[in-house]
Amino acid sequence: KKVVLGKKGDTVELTCTASQKKSIQFHWKNSNQIKILGNQGSFLTKGPSKLNDRADSRRSLWDQGNFPLIIKNLKIEDSDTYICEVEDQKEEVQLLVFGLTANSDTHLLQGQSLTLTLESPPGSSPSVQCRSPRGKNIQGGKTLSVSQLELQDSGTWTCTVLQNQKKVEFKIDIVVLAFQKASSIVYKKEGEQVEFSFPLAFTVEKLTGSGELWWQAERASSSKSWITFDLKNKEVSVKRVTQDPKLQMGKKLPLHLTLPQALPQYAGSGNLTLALEAKTGKLHQEVNLVVMRATQLQKNLTCEVWGPTSPKLMLSLKLENKEAKVSKREKAVWVLNPEAGMWQCLLSDSGQVLLESNIKVLPTWSTPVQP
């Protein structure tokens, strides 16, 4: 008995071939011997089966001795043994229809779980293997689960159902709703304008929700909400903003925030959350601000950084075009009695300068100049 695998919602064509290459009488029946369709001369006739409106054949092939049964919009319950009667012969074809669906919406938040459920006919024992867009393979039976979805899981999942050494392939498009970056860090000199950008890693026609930026300043004992906003069809409107600092927000996507100036008291970490309409859970992006200040007080030239810096970073003070006078794994370094000239304060990681601030040290009788 020939086995054919079909996909729920698809169309399947079951073949039946006569030895004579001409149009002769044929019938397709199900396992209960109920006629599905056949012919009367060159006319297609249909029986009283449940497939009535979904069953068809290809009249153009009858003259070649081919009498296929075409079933459209397959259902799991169409799984059955179909019998083609032609030339006093009976050809049996077992059709097994499978369906694979995502547990809920195919638009899931980062960190949520994806469950794929296999619908299969009674008596079948299929195995399923799915390959994610990033090449990760998962195997299972009736259900497959992937916890903690990541951004790289966005895209087409290819799932293969195996039964009786036959395969049927499903493709499911999954969209992971997330920000492009989980975390970002901005390095600024004191007084500079700060731009925070929160690009989304997905595009949808209509995007509605609400968001908030909570900020934990390094110098503060507790975090506070800096801004809350609404999102209506990709249009941003600010609901509430603190007076200090007074953030400005762009009216269109991507979400964009401007801090008028970087100050040591603002250095720290923020968490932007975005709650999307009709979705449980929130999108998160962490943002960090590191602020540098170079100052000269009397005979002491000091360079300081505030904010979440890695212990791998080096802070250096050097006279322009000379070797560093001091270079340490600290957030503050200083030079006593600095000689006159342009001094550079450098924050570097693996030899790459992340932040630089220049300060001009004048001969002792003058006051310092900050360019």
């Epitope: 212990p311 080096m314 560093a324 340490k328 794994r329 600290e330 957030k331 693996s350 030899g351 790459q352």
Partner: antibody
Amino acid sequence: QVQLVQSGAEVKKPGASVKVSCKASGGTFRNDVINWVRQAPGQGLEWIGWMNPNSGNTGYAQKFQGRVTMTRDTSTSTVYMELSSLRSEDTAVYYCARDNPDLDGMDVWGQGTLVTVSS
Amino acid sequence: DIVMTQSPDSLAVSLGERATINCKSSQSVLSSSYNKNYLAWYQQKPGQPPKLLIYWASTRESGVPDRFSGSGSGTDFTLTISSLQAEDVAVYYCQQYYSSPPTFGQGTRLEIK
């Protein structure tokens, strides 16, 4: 896991220059820093300087300023250390070593290149 | 530059016994900003390059046997081998990387008694 493979031994005359190479095999330089450290026969370890092969930035010990030049060829994942105006006291094994980018300390070392300075 | 001084210069210990090597820095290598001691220990066997054993004064590098441990803070540090094995015969170096340039101790030769 990246490995560092160095060029072979060199014999040089005083006043000449030597150029030692250090190639990343089984990987590429990420945001790594490559240090150069030398060891005179029967002596301890002495740091010469560092280079970031991605940015090209360098930093040299005061003692070697003006005599040492570190360069790189990103297409072959190779860094070079050139020491000029050689003198007999530069006879040593020269090592390249990677600064661990995630933790700290020099976690991957080349096998060493013996440079002999002799008239 | 920070000067690193190791003691003793050489040490002979019986197999299975404890070996202790000291390292002193001329100034503190403890970062008050990050609360970390920027000190590493290396092992060098004859004809081989050094091998990283310990970083941040007390964190063992992956794959290093747990008989090796590092301790200390500020200016005084210790490398301890709890039970000496034959393969531990080597020269051991401490190195500070708190301040540039990084500097090494002169080395301690460890032998079997």
